[in-house]
Amino acid sequence: ASVATELRCQCLQTLQGIHPKNIQSVNVKSPGPHCAQTEVIATLKNGRKACLNPASPIVKKIIEKMLNSDKSN
């Protein structure tokens, strides 16, 4: 991908809710020169990607659970 493509936010919008069972992994991108806000990008079990609302309590729980399962593996 070109540098121009990468230096921008990757989330067009955010899903307000998603069932954790559909999520394979979660990538939390901190704010930086490419994007002013935190982005939570979930890889779904069907191979698609989805952006989640980092302020959502459900999403916070999902991130916490994923990070904990990563630590235990």
Epitope: A1, S2, T5, E6, R8, C9, Q10, C11, L12, Q13, T14, L15, Q16, G17, I41, G47, R48, K49, A50, C51
Partner: antibody, heavy 121, light 111 residues
Framework: QIQLVQSGPELKKPGETVKISCKGS????????MHWVKQAPGKGLKWMGW????????TYADDFKGRFAFSLETSASTAYLQINNLKNEDTATYFC??????????????WGQGTLVSVSA | DIVLTQSPASLAVSLGQRATISCKAS??????????MNWYQQKPGQPPKLLIY???NLESGIPATFSGSGSGTDFTLNIHPVEEEDAATYYC?????????FGAGTKLELK
């Protein structure tokens, strides 16, 4: 089930304005971006741009800046495409398509049935 | 803009045979390990139907007679075996960057 239903065909004269609608159902309308695609008779597909259904912010492809406007009525789960000062070359079928939330989206799985706009004096 | 060049513009294939359609992008559509190339089928009077997303993933409800492959700039849609209802126009589309672009289309006819 997820559906996008568009308004019916329109016959207009050059210089007039047309506004076509696309109503989403079966999903949370404000979760997903909405895109518009033009197909002139017997031709291929051309992406016109998209509207953020959370914020209402539109993004237009270069060829569709100026006379074209995307808008929303979120309470009715409906997106609109308005074309001002119609020209003969605007004669086409216009499709709405539900996009994703990730910039590198994986294609449009849901489309409206299309709205034919015919422009003729 | 990323230009997508489809070939051939049209092809005629016998029932049960293989149809192969190529799509070449003017620059890479890869990002973060994925290739953002999608394939659609369109029949007259109907909207396009998504067949393949992210180069090789079969959309839900699409028969396994359709498959996609490729990365970077070179992509292929295969249909095997070709069935009667596959007569249509096929488009590739990149979703790597704005403006999103489509190939000019390949018309598949049955011999």
């Amino acid at each position: 089930q997820i559906q996008l239903v568009q308004s019916g065909p329109e016959l207009k004269k050059p210089g007039e304005t047309v506004k076509i609608s696309c109503k989403g159902s079966g999903y949370t309308f404000t979760d997903y971006s909405m895109h518009w695609v033009k197909q002139a008779p017997g031709k291929g597909l051309k992406w016109m741009g998209w509207i953020n259904t959370e914020t209402g912010e539109p993004t237009y492809a270069d060829d569709f800046k100026g006379r074209f406007a995307f808008s929303l009525e979120t309470s009715a789960s409906t997106a609109y495409l308005q074309i001002n000062n119609l020209k003969n070359e605007d004669t086409a079928t216009y499709f709405c398509a539900r996009g994703g939330v990730y910039r590198y989206d994986e294609g449009f799985a849901y489309w409206g049935q299309g709205t034919l706009v015919s422009v003729s004096a | 803009d990323i230009v997508l060049t489809q070939s051939p513009a049209s092809l005629a294939v016998s029932l049960g045979q293989r149809a192969t359609i190529s799509c070449k992008a003017s620059q890479s559509v890869d990002y973060d390990g994925d290739s953002y190339m999608n394939w659609y089928q369109q029949k007259p009077g109907q909207p396009p139907k998504l067949l393949i997303y992210a180069a090789s993933n079969l959309e839900s409800g699409i028969p396994a007679t359709f498959s996609g492959s490729g990365s970077g700039t070179d992509f292929t849609l295969n249909i095997h075996p070709v069935e009667e209802e596959d007569a249509a126009t096929y488009y590739c589309q990149q979703s790597h960057e704005d403006p999103l672009t489509f190939g000019a289309g390949t018309k598949l006819e049955l011999k």
